[in-house]
């Protein structure tokens, strides 16, 4: 009954300080997007309700922004927010869909940069 | 107060067509799957189909496709259930009713509209 | 598809009666499970969704138990606006119903 597939930007990398935009795609399915929910491994981010719009989690409301579109956009980067993200699409008459991406937060050039003056 | 309001009944000749309208009121119209249900006198419930508020796609229940087409207006929050070529056994009361829930367990009917008797006699 | 089964399909209780309405699933659909009541010439009117979820606005007399293949609806004490058919419906795929119990005052 499930024919339809979640396709995500995969694995991805991003600056500390920086921004990443997280984004889910749900094709080749007729059924009925009601919310999308986003998590990082148990933690619910934010939901997009196709009724009530957009919930943000209080604990991320400053660093994490609804859209484009479904996805999601994380600003103010810090290495600890490595790890895996998950879309997960409810819909009708299908039931859930999820798709995964990994996040690797590197350190920002600047650090990269300071190695150089180290004394040999 | 959100409802459902269908088109009144109707009493057609064997080999007609008729056109059932369902009006949503109270919500967005456009964010709720809509269901197609069928009742016969004395019977239970028979699930018709669904269509996508969203994208206008239909989907047909077996025992529900040909001549059983589910469409939208969404400009004016209405959806429609038309059957053609109507047959005496397509007697029955046809009700629209919208999916409720986030999504996972919680989805179920939770607005049904009055329902519409449709009667097949010559 | 997947068919429901109701057990019975007619019953006859008194007001103030616990009585208890079955639905068996041809196979495991989880929780993914509804209750619908019906009087003659109205729309069905949801009770229970998430198998035990009551809806809002309905009586708590009325409660949903079960999980897979197997549920219940009881209804700890009979009213008098009690009296009338009962429906499971499974979404764990394309949705279908159950053929119903008539409740009935004895």
């Known amino acids: 009954m499930m024919t339809g597939t979640i396709e995500t930007t995969g694995n991805i990398s991003a600056e500390k300080g920086g921004s990443i935009i997280l984004q889910c795609h749900l094709s080749s399915t007729t059924a009925q997007v009601t919310q999308v929910n986003w998590e990082q491994q148990d933690q619910l981010l934010a939901i997009c309700n196709a009724d009530l719009g957009w919930h943000i989690s209080p604990s991320f409301k400053d660093r994490v922004a609804p859209g484009p579109g479904l996805g999601l956009t994380l600003q103010s980067l810090t290495v600890n927010d490595t790890g895996e993200y998950f879309c997960i699409y409810h819909t009708y008459p299908d039931g859930t869909y999820t798709g995964r991406i990994f996040l690797e937060v590197l350190e920002s050039s600047v650090a990269e940069h300071g190695a150089r003056f180290q004394i040999p | 107060e959100i409802q459902l309001v269908q088109s009144g009944s109707e009493l057609k000749k064997p080999g007609a067509s008729v056109k059932v309208s369902c009006k949503a009121s109270?919500?967005?119209?456009?964010?709720?799957?809509m269901n197609w249900v069928r009742q016969a006198p004395g019977q239970g419930l028979e699930w018709m189909g669904w269509i996508n508020t969203n994208t206008g796609n239909p989907t047909n229940a077996q025992g529900f496709t040909g001549r059983f087409v589910f469409s939208l207006d969404t400009s004016v929050s209405t959806a429609y259930l038309q059957i053609s070529s109507l047959k005496a056994e397509d007697t029955a009361v046809y009700y629209c009713a919208r999916v409720g829930g986030y999504g996972g367990y919680d989805y179920a009917f939770d607005i049904w509209g009055q329902g519409t008797m449709v009667t097949v006699s010559s | 598809d997947i068919q429901l089964t109701q057990s019975p399909s007619f019953l006859s209780a008194s007001v103030g009666d616990r009585v208890t309405i079955t639905c068996r699933a041809s196979q495991g659909i989880s929780s993914y499970l509804a209750w619908y009541q019906q009087k003659p010439g109205k729309a069905p009117k949801l009770l229970i969704y998430?198998?035990?979820t009551l809806q809002s606005g309905v009586p708590s007399r009325f409660s949903g138990s079960g999980s897979g293949t197997e549920f219940t609806l009881t209804i700890s004490s009979l009213q008098p606006e009690d009296f009338a058919t009962y429906y499971c419906q499974q979404l764990n795929s394309y949705p279908t119903f159950g053929g119903g119990t008539k409740l009935e005052i004895k």
């Open positions: 998430a198998a035990s």
């Open positions: 109270g919500y967005t119209f456009t964010s709720y799957p």
